[in-house]
Interface confidence: low
Amino acid sequence: MSLLSVPHTESVSLSTGSTVTIEARPLVCFFNEPHLQVDFHTEMKEDSDIAFHFQVYFGNRVVMNSREYRTWKEEVESKNMPFQDGQEFELRILVLEDKYQVMVNGQAYYNFNHRIPVSSVKMVQVWRDISLTKFNVSN
């Protein structure tokens, strides 16, 4: 199975009903505190606004947020940690009418209400301490 380069950046066009699918594995054991970060940018630039920021501190917590006018907004934290040490996982981000819903291995765990219109999202970036085997956007 070929690995995708990380950071992995793709231009996207999202709307209600879109699904972003990511398959990956933490690069190191949880004891070394690897991270996963997924950012939905409003432009094809890393310093642009972020409609949805999803960050996993493996073995610890998940943080969700948005960045507007270069300012981070109110953080949403979850202690749910369905990821297993050393195990590959499938992450699906569903674009619903009112929120993003994040599923891990087929089960819904996280929700993040839209703060920036989904139509503004132009690019998705997946990065940090993971090996990435799949990135797919279906509309």
Epitope: F30, G59, N60, N80, M81, P82
Partner: nanobody, 121 residues
Amino acid sequence: QVQVQESGGGLVQAGNSLRLSCAASGRTFSSYHMMWFRQAPGKEREFVAAIAWRGGTYCANSVKGRCTISRDNAKDTVYLQMNSLKPEDTAVYFCAASLRYVFDPSAMDYWGKGTLVTVSS
């Protein structure tokens, strides 16, 4: 495989404290996240507290500030300390082990049989 057994339940006066123990057997105990759930009569099983294999802890909002969860990997035991008990804390308390740090009963890999805690006013 992990077997878990709870102890320490009983009748307690409201306002008092209680420490529950969960003894586990199985060589891989230290790699499991350990959780406490409770089930009051006629109600669904609800999450109380969790301790990750590395020691990070989390208590549900319903017991926050009154709950301390700890583990002793050398003794293969998890402890739940509950302070300022209320009549609504009356329930059967269950210990569970999971490879996933998720506060959902359906995600647990192993369960104990439970220990009854009755809080009288």
